[in-house]
Interface confidence: medium
């Protein structure tokens, strides 16, 4: 059956300077390929975090994704700023051999509202 990506929260509100968790789980680790978080959609979407080892300032994974059969790809964003507002999508990709990775499933999106402190 097709992998399913779930973001249970429709929205989260966070005060500027605080941290927030964006929840995402998948039903399967197959097909092989990374999970990435984006803000926005289409041409303007911005890569926020990738579970592929790179360093992303202010963002880290919540659970240990190196553990076998871990299905939780939630992230924590710390020291949130007004520029962090927007809709975040957790996206599953299928790894390409020579061609680029292919997006196969996206979560429904979680809108982040940033409140003035």
């Amino acid at each position: 059956t097709e992998v399913k990506v779930t973001q249970p929260e429709k929205s989260v509100s966070v005060a500027a300077g605080d941290s927030t968790i964006l929840n995402c789980t998948v039903t399967s680790l197959l097909p092989v390929g990374p999970i990435r978080w984006y803000r926005g959609v289409g041409q303007s979407r911005l890569l926020i975090y990738s579970f592929t080892g790179e360093h992303f300032p202010r963002i880290r994974n919540v659970s240990d994704t190196t553990k076998r059969n871990n299905m939780d790809f939630s992230i924590r964003i710390s020291n949130v700023t007004p520029e962090d507002a927007g809709t975040y999508y957790c996206v599953k990709f299928q790894r390409g051999s020579s061609e680029p990775d292919t997006e196969i499933q996206s979560g429904g999106g979680t809108e982040v509202y940033v409140l003035a402190k």
Epitope: K4, T6, P8, E9, K10, S11, V12, T25, G108
Partner: antibody, heavy 119, light 108 residues
Framework: EVQLVESGGGVVQPGRSLRLSCAAS????????VNWVRQAPGKGLEWVSL????????YYADSVKGRFTISRDNSKNTLYLQMNSLRAEDTAVYYC????????????WGQGTLVTVSS | EIVLTQSPGTLSLSPGERATLSCRAS??????LAWYQQKPGQAPRLLIY???SRATGIPDRFSGSGSGTEFTLTISSLQSEDFAVYYC??????????FGGGTKVEIK
Amino acid sequence: EVQLVESGGGVVQPGRSLRLSCAASGFTFSSYDVNWVRQAPGKGLEWVSLISGSGEIIYYADSVKGRFTISRDNSKNTLYLQMNSLRAEDTAVYYCAKENNRYRFFDDWGQGTLVTVSS
Amino acid sequence: EIVLTQSPGTLSLSPGERATLSCRASQSVYTYLAWYQQKPGQAPRLLIYGASSRATGIPDRFSGSGSGTEFTLTISSLQSEDFAVYYCQQYYDRPPLTFGGGTKVEIK
């Protein structure tokens, strides 16, 4: 105080159509996703359809897909359910239900309107 | 689609007794579970969300617990107004949103 008032129910023959309305007040209607949930006589609750605050996102239960259409008019604070090709098994009390702003559970419900499909 | 199974179907108890209602999910819904109360001729009313958080205005004799696939609604001491049908609902999965079949709490 949040109020949801359904109307438009009644007795209708199989194959015919009916349009339900839900008038909302006491909250910023356009900011909330709203749903239709039904309950057949003596039975449990069955989710029917969902529409997002902007109207851009819509979901249906498989049992009504292709026959029912959910819509909303944010300028009138009103939710609609257009029901076509009605069947006996669509007989139920239809409730409109306002979702929580963060999660998909229902913190406010209307009183319901009864739809009876019978020849 | 996530299936919710409630048990028992009917619970016959006396006022003052403790009621324990169960809801089992076909797959993990973490703590994304709500409980509703419905009295005859009335709309459902939200009691519990997040598996254990009481909704506004709900008396503290109502409590929810559980996570994953097993959930419990407990009414510590039944009052006359608590005799009703109770439904669980998961909101972890993207629609279709699903309800359990209900548990009727009746006077013994």
